[in-house]
């Protein structure tokens, strides 16, 4: 664009150099050339000469009018045709921008990843604004009334060291640009309720050579949280439907989960956990692929009547991937309950 240009005159924009996309815009060019009474004044947009909607206002000034200007950025310049000059003479130039006022930030979420030392807040920014837009994150203690503000562009990490005076906070986000400001809804945060346990990792899996082979999946976490609720989902690599098993876990030792699976098949396993009774889940762990061994004796394998082990498994349900290209995006289709209480309704955010 044009940032530093020696002008022999002036160029100005109505309603302003940054305006709302879709507005009608007038751009004026006024020459102040020495030894030139211009025959014509010309406008250029992004280097291309404009031909329409140009009005000569008087000897020194011309205007170009744009109906519903909808380009996010353009650089404009104007020139004069001076008698006796072979080339046009530059008068002035301006960068212009159009955009939108921000939408109100939505889906504000704040979590503390265990051991991170930060509260991470994220939100949906809404539609693109096309112009510089900042987010002011307000964090107000409900106990001391002290308010802190943080500037962000899409998310913010706030050191928990600066949140030591209180456990309860009100958090909200203001989206601001030169065209407007909008506030998110306020989020009530209790620091003890937003901790996400340290990442859960599937370390290995093995299939036994028993008459009825079983697969044991080993998984662990460095979490110090005592009561943790976890889900493990698994499926064959050729299938779109995941089965989900739920566990109450105690990570003072490596977890072992037993599965009766189809022989000679490649399975994918993933696990995620949350503090029991809280609402924030870990992201699903990296996919762990395991090949079950070949069938040794003949038997009828019935996947949905297989004996699930005595572990703290509560429910098994099925979810189906929306697309084979997006294995992380899941949608609850049905829940098949094997024992214990029904699924807790948390499956809508699987993925």
């Amino acid at each position: 664009g044009i940032t530093s240009i020696n002008c022999s005159g002036d160029m100005w924009v109505e309603p302003g150099e940054i305006f709302q996309m879709g507005m009608n815009v007038s751009i004026y060019c006024q020459e102040a050339l020495k030894h030139c009474r211009p025959r014509n004044l010309y406008f250029y947009k992004n280097g291309f000469k404009e031909e329409f909607d140009i009005t000569r206002i008087n000897r020194t000034t011309a205007r170009i009018w744009y109906k519903g200007f909808s380009e996010p950025h353009a650089y404009m310049h104007c020139t004069a045709e001076c008698p006796g000059h072979f080339q046009e003479t530059l008068i002035c130039g301006k960068d212009i921008s159009s955009g939108h006022p921000p939408d109100a930030p939505s889906n504000l979420t704040c979590v503390i990843y265990e051991y991170s030392g930060n509260m991470t807040c994220t939100w949906n920014t809404g539609k693109p604004t096309y112009i510089d837009t900042k987010y002011i994150v307000h964090v107000k203690s409900l106990e001391t009334e002290e308010e802190q503000q943080y500037l962000a562009s899409s998310y913010v990490k706030i050191s928990t060291d600066s949140l030591q005076g209180s456990r309860k906070y009100l958090v909200w986000v203001q989206a601001v640009n030169s065209l407007g400001m909008e506030n998110s809804q306020q989020l009530h945060v209790h620091l003890d309720d937003i901790v996400i346990p340290s990442a859960s990792i599937i370390s290995r899996a093995e299939t036994t050579n028993d008459t009825v082979p079983k697969t044991i999946v080993y998984w662990k976490s460095k979490t110090m949280i005592e009561k943790v609720f976890c889900e493990m989902r698994y499926k064959t690599t050729t299938n779109q439907t995941w089965s989900v098993k739920e566990f109450d876990a105690n990570f003072t030792y490596v977890q072992q989960s037993e599965f009766y699976l189809e022989p000679d098949s490649k399975y994918v396993f993933q696990v995620r956990c949350q503090e029991t009774g809280k609402r924030n889940w870990q992201p699903w762990s990296s996919p762990f692929v395991h090949q079950t061994s070949q069938e040794t004796g003949k038997r009828n394998w019935q996947p949905w009547s297989s004996p699930f082990v005595h572990q703290t498994s509560q429910t098994v349900s099925q979810v189906t991937a929306k697309s084979s290209h997006e294995p992380q995006k899941m949608e609850m289709l049905s829940a098949t309950i094997f024992r214990g209480h029904p699924a807790s309704g948390n499956h809508q955010d699987i993925g």
Partner: nanobody
Framework: QVQLQESGGGSVQAGGSLRLSCAAS????????MGWYRQAPGKERDLVSM???????FYADSVKGRFTFSQENAKNTVYLQMNSLKPEDTAMYYC??????????WGQGTQVTVSS
């Protein structure tokens, strides 16, 4: 760390004008997104005006057309020209240095009182 010092507040009749100044010292001033904020008694601290990296400026609806933000980079100083002042503009005015991901740093503030 940036230090900010506001000045220029005072008492004025409705319809009058004031020019607030905010002088910044410290080596990280260049990374600041500078803004003017105000806080009336018992209210939140609200953004009045902020300048963006593209050179554009935000003004709160309540001050549009009356207040003008300007800056003098050579002096590390920003200004808020306040015209046509109203009683509802009465507040403590603060300038703030905001850098991405960091807590906003405030000056001590300067009191503006507009009487009718």
């Amino acid at each position: 760390q940036v230090q900010l010092q506001e000045s220029g507040g005072g008492s004025v009749q409705a319809g009058g004008s004031l020019r607030l100044s905010c002088a910044a010292s410290g080596d990280t001033y260049s990374s600041c997104t500078m803004g003017w904020y105000r806080q009336a008694p018992g209210k939140e601290r609200d953004l009045v005006s902020m300048v963006f990296s593209d050179g554009s400026t935000f003004y709160a609806d309540s001050v549009k057309g009356r207040f003008t933000f300007s800056q003098e980079n050579a002096k590390n100083t920003v200004y808020l020209q306040m015209n046509s002042l109203k009683p509802e503009d009465t507040a403590m005015y603060y300038c703030g240095c905001a850098t991405l991901g960091s807590r906003t740093i405030w000056g001590q503030g300067t009191q503006v009182t507009v009487s009718s």
